[in-house]
Each structure stands twice: as structure tokens, then as C-alpha cells.
Interface confidence: low
């Protein structure tokens, strides 16, 4: 058969949950402390909450059925009677009472024909303000007749016909009634919720609803023009040219900011947005949803997309509607011919209307932003240049911030890219130019996207002119080749000498993509004599071991994930892992990761790695322990860092000396 409507699916779920209590029993969730009841969907059933409020489960006869004394469940179908009597069956006795008062309407409800009545519950009538009720029942009851006729349709309409966004023609001056049928099974009629649906009568059908509904006369634009509280909004809509859309056909939800909402925004921000047509349009579009959303449809958190493209979390807390968790809706369900308006008392400024400063204010990067300000880079972050700001998280500076000197200023300039980027378009190997004139490289890994040593820690925030990338560390642009990095650091004098003697200098100086696990002098000194002697005994072996320390791609710590098997230049794979923010290679911790070079990255280690084939095994022809001498000499040689040192002859002499 045809696909079931959401309402029918929810009813089916309720029936399923109630079946252990007998035939045609439906499980109903009642919000504690209220009379609000809901047929229950799967999610609500397990959460036992509606709008964050606890519910109790009760079991009632499903629509159209009744109990039989002495029998389990609700085995009997309700007897069919006319519409007037069916009003009593569904408990809408006040509607019966008012029908009697009109004199004309009861004969119609009891006579031939086929009608649909959206009958307000007794509570709905009781909750009408006294002056509204008085006006309905005065004027020789003509207003009451008109009001009741507006609740009627001149044919039988069942819930499976009630489609989202459709309009029905009422029996009062052919005025439209707006129907919304939401994916969660809730059906609304002019934003009044269907409580009990599809109660058949001999001459039609009755649906019980939770409000008295009234005719809709104005479109969204007209409501904005009428209401004093929308004076600022009115001007903004006119300036943006959105009034045409808001008075046209369609079904929209306008989250309409009141004058008070605009007043909460600092003058500088508001003036900037109001003076920028694109930002203004984005701001207003961020308050418009693509379809009509009645408050009654919200029973839990729901992600909705605005016309601007931002996702808002619409939810509820008790009787209050919330947006992004805040109860900022002050007046809900103001119906228009082309949608529904909810008054909000806070402006929803989208990222696309914000400066980089404003984007950063809502991110966890305030420390970095203060540094940019102090370094005199504030203009770039609030102007109309197309830029991308690479802003490290506050946690990066937990041990303090650097002093603002020339070096820091330059470093910060290299955190600003001269283009407005989106991370989804970045690709591996791409280079990005900074305000400081540096070229930064992009590295794309399975679970991360990094720019040099720093990886993106949160979704981009794309502003009016600039985009904010929240980064997981301070970015350090490369200052030279791997060889330059090693030569410039006293900790690696022995490694430099070893690299030179193994003939790998050129490799680590030329263009390329290398990950070098660089053992410190201490690492070499800590080698067991046997390993040291083996390492030094053979230039080829030395080259082999050194190549095992060099990966054939750039792997920064942010790209490791849990475990990466990195192919070395020697051929075997290195097991690189990250646990509790500590990088390890072959299960040995890295002392200092991510020293960037133009042709790679250096990770400092305090041990020398052994390739699988070299892992210690007993050999009879052990070299003498005095091999340590080579490192004493290498250390001295390499301090003269500008000279190229050839150690092959030194090896020969040492090996001669080591023979017994």
C-alpha cells in the first residue's frame, strides 16, 4: 500500500507499545504537571521526555475504539453517530455547547453532507482570553458562528490527506486553513496541534485540536509593517530588498528580532552590518527558515537550516521554545498567509556577517586574538581584506604568552593567510602565502588537516571577509632544510657528523618530503657499546640505520591518529603512534615533535632506532668499545657547522686501532 504518513507511523508505534494491554490500546506520553499528551515515537519512548520535561506513560483506547466491560483492551469500534454527537465522544463538549448557541450550525452537523471539524478541546476554549470569548458570544452569536465555521471543511479530510504545507478551504468565507504535517508525526492546523484525529462520523470526521484557530489575513511583510516592535527589522528588511520575498508566496518561518534584540548589539557591530548590503542580507536570511515551523511541532532538539545556510538548533524547555539552547523566543506562532513568525529578543548574527574579531570572540582563541591586537595586526582582522586567520586554541598558551617583539610579530603575521580559504577545498601539498611572506604547506591526513605543524581543531568559521581556522598549536614556519635544522642545534652534532659520513647530506638538503626522527647526542651516547660499534664499523650500515630514521613523507604529530606505519628510506616501516598527546616511534616516546623544515619535519628522539634486521643478536666478531671515540671526534667536527666534514679516513684509522 501507500507509504504511511508520519502521524500514522507514530500512531502505529503507540499501538505497538500498547498491545500487551489488549487490542487497540495505544501508549500515550503525558507531560508531568500538565494535560499535554502525545502519541509516542521511538525516541521519546526511550527518553521518557518531551521538551526536556519528564513524562508518564498511560494506556488509552486508540482513536475510534472503546472498552467493553469485562474484556481486555479496547475491542469495540466506536459506534458511528453524527458530527454533533461525535464532538461529545472526543470530549469537545464546549464546542457542542457553542454549536447549540449558534442555532444554525447544529442542524448542519446532524444533517446530511460530509464535513470535517477541527474541534478545539474544552481546555482550548477555556484558555481564550475573556474579552475574546465575550466578543464571540455577543453580536447575536454571528461571530461565534463564523468562528466555528472557520474550524470546518466542506468534505471529509483524514490525516493521511493532511500533507505538510497544504491549505484547506474552510466553510467561513472560503478562508484558508494551514496544515503542517511534521516528520515527528505531529500535525498542526494553523499551528494548533491535532490531539485526537480521524474520529469518524456518519456525516464526516472530527479532529480534536489544542487551540481555537482564527483566520489568517496578513503576510509576513504586512505583520512586520504593522508591529511597532519591528521598527528596526522593518528598516533592515526594506534596505535589504527582502520585503518582496516576505510578501510573496511560499511558506517561511521568520524568527523576527524585536527592536530590543537589535539594541543588544554594540553600535560598532550594528553600524557595520547595516552599512554592508551583503552582511545585512546574510543577517536577515539567518532569521528565515525555508518552511513554516509551528512551536507545537517541537518536542525535542531539531537542527534546521536558515536561508543563509547556518544550522540552528531549535528546541524546547517546557513551554518555552529555544534557539541554540537559549529561551529567546518571546512570542510564538504568529500566523501569516505565507508562514509563521516567532518574535525573538536576541539577534542571530551568522558567521558570514562577522569580522574575524567577532568570529574569534565566540571561539576558544581569545588569547591568540589579544596577541594579534597587541602586535598591531588588529586592522587585518577587522577590515575588508580577504584573509584566513590561523588562530591557536587558548589551551596552547596555558603556560603563558610570548612577549610582543619583532620575532613574535613576524610569527603572528605568518598566522594570517592572504586569501579567504575554506578547509574543504585545501589539498595535500598546497602552499599558502602569509602576510609575513612565508609559504606554508598543507598536509591532508586520514583524520586531520594540517598547515605545517599545526592542525585544524574545529570547523572553519567563514566570516564576511575572513575565515577563522582554529588551530591546535602555534604554527612554526620552516626556517631551512632538515640539514639546516640539525646543524643549527647543538643537540644533533653527532647526528650531523653521522649523516655527513654516511653521504646523506645532499638528500636532506634537497627538495623533498621527509620525516626525520633525529636522535640527540645523548641518544648516541646511550647506545650499548656493541650497537655503537656495529653502527660505526661500516659506513654502509651507518647509512642503512640513518635511512631507517627517515620517513618518505611528511608526518606531523597532528596527522598520526592512533597508529601510522611510515615507510622509511631504508625500506622497513616505522610504527608511529600517538597516545595521551605523546608521539612514539616503535613504542619509544618522542622528546620534541614537529620541528618544521622546508623539505620535511624533524622529531627529536632520545634513542637510536634499530631496523628489524639489526635488532640485537649475538655475534662473535664484536667491534671494540673504543668506537665511542668516533663520536667524540664527530661532535667536535660538527660544531664547525659550516664545514663539510668527511669522516671516512677517520673511521679507517679508528678501526685499525680497535683491532686486537
Amino acid at each position: 500500500g501507500p507509504a504511511k504518513s508520519p502521524y500514522q507511523l507514530v500512531l502505529q508505534h503507540s499501538r505497538l507499545r500498547g498491545r500487551q494491554h489488549g487490542p487497540n490500546v495505544c501508549a500515550v506520553q503525558k507531560v508531568i504537571g500538565t494535560n499535554r499528551k502525545y502519541f509516542t515515537n521511538c525516541k521519546q519512548w526511550y527518553q521518557r521526555k518531551i521538551c526536556g520535561k519528564s513524562t508518564v506513560i498511560s494506556y488509552e483506547c486508540c482513536p475510534g475504539y472503546e472498552k467493553v466491560p469485562g474484556e481486555k483492551g479496547c475491542p469495540a469500534a466506536l459506534p458511528l453517530s453524527n458530527l454533533y454527537e461525535t464532538l461529545g465522544v472526543v470530549g469537545s463538549t464546549t464546542t457542542q455547547l457553542y454549536t447549540d448557541r449558534t442555532e444554525k450550525l447544529r442542524p448542519e452537523m446532524e444533517g446530511p453532507g460530509s464535513f470535517t471539524i477541527f474541534a478545539p478541546s474544552n481546555e482550548a476554549w477555556a484558555s481564550l482570553p475573556a474579552e475574546v470569548l465575550d466578543s464571540l458570544v455577543s453580536n447575536v452569536n454571528i461571530e461565534l458562528l463564523n468562528a466555528l465555521r472557520y474550524h470546518m471543511v466542506g468534505r471529509r479530510v483524514l490525516t493521511d490527506e493532511l500533507k505538510h504545507g497544504m491549505t484547506l478551504t474552510s466553510m467561513y468565507q472560503n478562508s484558508n486553513i494551514q496544515i503542517h504535517h511534521y516528520p515527528n508525526g505531529i500535525v498542526t492546523v494553523n499551528c494548533a496541534r491535532l490531539l485526537k484525529a480521524d474520529h469518524h462520523a456518519t456525516n464526516g470526521v472530527v479532529h480534536l485540536i489544542d487551540k481555537v484557530i482564527s483566520t489568517i489575513t496578513n503576510n509576513i511583510q504586512q505583520i512586520i509593517e504593522i508591529e511597532d516592535t519591528f521598527e528596526t527589522l522593518r528598516a533592515a528588511v526594506a534596505a535589504s530588498g527582502l520585503n518582496t520575498m516576505l510578501e510573496g508566496n511560499g511558506q517561511y518561518t521568520l524568527l523576527a528580532p524585536t527592536n530590543e534584540a537589535f539594541e543588544k548589539i554594540p553600535s560598532e557591530t550594528l553600524n557595520r552590518i547595516l552599512g554592508d548590503p551583503e552582511a545585512l542580507r546574510d543577517l536577515l536570511n539567518n532569521h528565515i527558515l525555508k518552511s513554516a515551523m509551528c512551536a507545537e511541532a517541537i518536542v525535542a532538539g531539531l537542527s534546521v537550516e536558515t536561508l543563509e545556510g547556518t544550522t540552528l538548533e531549535v528546541g524546547c524547555s517546557g513551554d518555552m521554545l529555544t534557539i541554540n539552547g537559549k529561551a529567546i523566543i518571546s512570542n510564538k506562532d504568529i500566523l501569516a498567509t505565507n508562514g509563521v513568525i516567532h518574535y525573538i529578543d536576541e539577534l542571530l548574527i551568522p558567521d558570514s556577517a562577522k569580522t574575524l574579531f567577532e568570529l574569534a570572540a565566540e571561539s576558544d582563541v581569545s588569547t591568540a586574538i589579544d596577541l594579534f591586537r597587541q602586535a598591531g595586526l588588529g586592522n587585518h582582522l577587522s577590515g575588508s581584506e580577504r584573509l584566513t586567520l590561523l588562530a591557536p586554541l587558548n589551551s596552547v598558551f596555558k603556560d603563558g604568552t610570548p612577549p610582543i617583539d619583532a620575532h613574535t610579530r613576524n610569527l603572528l603575521r605568518n598566522h594570517i593567510i592572504k586569501d579567504q580559504l575554506a578547509s574543504k577545498y585545501l589539498y595535500h601539498g598546497q602552499t599558502l602565502e602569509t602576510l609575513g611572506g612565508k609559504k606554508l604547506r598543507v598536509f591532508v591526513y586520514r583524520n586531520s588537516l594540517c598547515i605545517e605543524n599545526s592542525c585544524i581543531a574545529a570547523h572553519d568559521k567563514r566570516g564576511r571577509y575572513g575565515t577563522l581556522f582554529t588551530m591546535d598549536r602555534v604554527l612554526t614556519p620552516p626556517m631551512g632544510t632538515v640539514m639546516d635544522v640539525l646543524k643549527g642545534d647543538n643537540r644533533f652534532s653527532m647526528l650531523v657528523a653521522a649523516i655527513q659520513s654516511a653521504g646523506l647530506t645532499e638528500t636532506l638538503n634537497r627538495e623533498g618530503v621527509y620525516t626525520v626522527f633525529a636522535p640527540t647526542n645523548e641518544a648516541f651516547r646511550a647506545l650499548p657499546p656493541r650497537e655503537r660499534s656495529r653502527l660505526l664499523g661500516d659506513a654502509k650500515e651507518l647509512a642503512n640505520i640513518l635511512k631507517y630514521h627517515i620517513g618518505d613523507e611528511i608526518l606531523v604529530s597532528g596527522g598520526i591518529g592512533a597508529l601510522v606505519r611510515l615507510k622509511s628510506l631504508q625500506g622497513d616501516k616505522l610504527e608511529v603512534s600517538l597516545k595521551n598527546n605523546v608521539v612514539s616511534v616503535n613504542k619509544e616516546p618522542v622528546a620534541e615533535p614537529d620541528i618544521m623544515a622546508t623539505n620535511g619535519v624533524v622529531h627529536v628522539i632520545t634513542n637510536v632506532l634499530q631496523p628489524p634486521a639489526n635488532r640485537p643478536q649475538e655475534r662473535g666478531d664484536e667491534l671494540a668499545d673504543s668506537a665511542l671515540e668516533i663520536f667524540k671526534q664527530a661532535s667536535a667536527f660538527s660544531r664547525a657547522s659550516q664545514r663539510s666534514v668527511r669522516l671516512a679516513p677517520v673511521y679507517q684509522k679508528l678501526l685499525e686501532r680497535m683491532k686486537h
Epitope: P266, E268, N271, G378, N379, S382, G383
Partner: antibody, heavy 120, light 113 residues
């Protein structure tokens, strides 16, 4: 370094006009919001008006609205304040002030001040 | 407009001692979206232009000694000078930049006791 050098003192009669200037150097003038703040003799500070970085927007204190005009000339990096329909209560030291950056509105750098005396 | 009220009008403190002055705004200067307070403090010595000390209610301007600190949020703010130096005796103004017209407090005169 940032410098804001203001024109000299002026003595004017009530109802007359005067134009005070402020020459900026040491920074990109067109990248900053600029302000005028005044201080009547023995009194506190009072914001007079603001002009945006591009000179498109100007905002004034209610007391001076319609009488004072702020303009800027990016080619000469000069800020102006034209005071017309002068009153005795306009007697004050007028300070030219540079904002922190393109939007943020606190007063980061101040000129030396220009004394305007309105007396019959 | 937002009215800024400073207290006391005059504060007499000995050099080396701590000075604390208050500033109250007639409405909150805390902007919820960025959790920043739009308030600045200035120092003015006789015959001189004012000088920026603090912005965002608590961020010291570059070059301002660490003995100056700002605190507070919403409508109540404080400027504290931890150990007064002779050059600190001056008039101090708070200023809001949350809404036009930008307004100053009437000033607190810090004098030698």
C-alpha cells in the same frame, strides 16, 4: 611612532565658526576610526563625535549634532572638526583621538589638544 | 544614554599603598556573544592629554605597568593600582564603548595623602 598633531588655539565669538585640524603620522590613517573628545575647563571628558575609517559614517553627541561636522582627508592624513553656531559652553580643549583599529571603539592614541575659547 | 558613575570623586592614598576606585554603568556593558565588557580606563595628568590604561575592562594596554589592573563585569568595574608611585597621582576616567553616545565617568582624582 604614532603622532597626532593638532592645530593651534582659537578664540571665537558666539555664533561664529572655526575649523580645527589634526595631522596624523606613523600609521595608515585610512585604516582607523577617528574621534574628537573635548574637556571643558575643570570638567571631565566628553565624547564629541566619531568618523569611520573610510569617512562614510560620522556620529555626533546630541549637544553638537547639526552644529559640528567631522571630516577626514586621506590624501593628507588629516582629521577636521568644524564647529559652527558656537556657544560659550563649547569652550573646551578638543582632543583628536585615534581608535585601536578599524572598528573597536576605545581611545588608543590622543593628540595634544586644541583650546577653543568662545567668548563675547 | 549609558551613564557612568565613578566613586569616590577624590581618593587620598599614600605612596606605596594600594588604590582602588570604582565605576558603575547604568546598564550592563557585557556583550553576551563574546563575553567581553566594553569598558576602558584612562589616566590624565594636569595639562596633558589622557592616556589609555585598560580596555575590555581588564586588558592592559602595551607599555602600562603591571601595577595597574582592571576588573569587574556587567555594571560594576574597578581599577586597582597595587603600589602607588609618585607618577600615578592623576585623574582617572572610565569610559564605555558599548553604545553611542560613548560616555565617560566624571573622574576620580587620586591625590597624595
Amino acid at each position: 611612532q604614532v603622532q597626532l598633531v593638532q592645530s593651534g588655539a582659537e578664540v571665537k565669538k558666539p555664533g561664529s565658526s572655526v575649523k580645527v585640524s589634526c595631522k596624523a603620522s606613523g600609521f595608515t590613517f585610512s585604516d582607523y576610526y577617528m574621534y574628537w573628545v573635548r574637556q571643558a575647563p575643570g570638567q571631565g571628558l566628553e565624547w564629541v563625535g566619531t568618523i569611520s575609517d573610510g569617512g562614510i559614517y560620522a556620529y555626533y553627541a546630541q549637544k553638537v549634532q547639526g552644529r559640528f561636522t567631522i571630516t577626514r582627508d586621506s590624501s593628507t592624513s588629516t582629521l577636521y572638526l568644524e564647529l559652527s553656531s558656537l556657544r560659550s559652553e563649547d569652550t573646551a580643549v578638543y582632543y583628536c583621538v585615534r581608535g585601536w583599529d578599524r572598528y573597536d571603539s576605545w581611545f588608543a592614541c590622543w593628540g595634544q589638544g586644541t583650546t577653543v575659547t568662545v567668548s563675547s | 544614554e549609558i551613564v557612568m558613575t565613578q566613586s569616590p570623586a577624590t581618593l587620598s592614598v599614600s605612596p606605596g599603598e594600594r588604590a582602588t576606585m570604582s565605576c558603575r554603568a547604568s546598564q550592563s556593558l557585557l556583550y553576551s556573544s563574546n563575553q567581553k565588557n566594553y569598558l576602558a580606563w584612562y589616566q590624565q595628568k594636569p595639562g596633558q592629554a589622557p592616556r589609555l590604561l585598560i580596555y575590555w575592562a581588564s586588558t592592559r594596554e602595551t607599555g602600562i605597568p603591571a601595577r595597574f589592573s582592571g576588573s569587574g563585569s556587567g555594571t560594576e568595574f574597578t581599577l586597582t593600582i597595587s603600589s602607588l608611585q609618585s607618577e600615578d597621582f592623576a585623574v582617572y576616567y572610565c569610559q564605555q564603548y558599548y553604545r553611542y553616545p560613548y560616555t565617560f565617568g566624571q573622574g576620580t582624582k587620586l591625590e597624595i595623602k
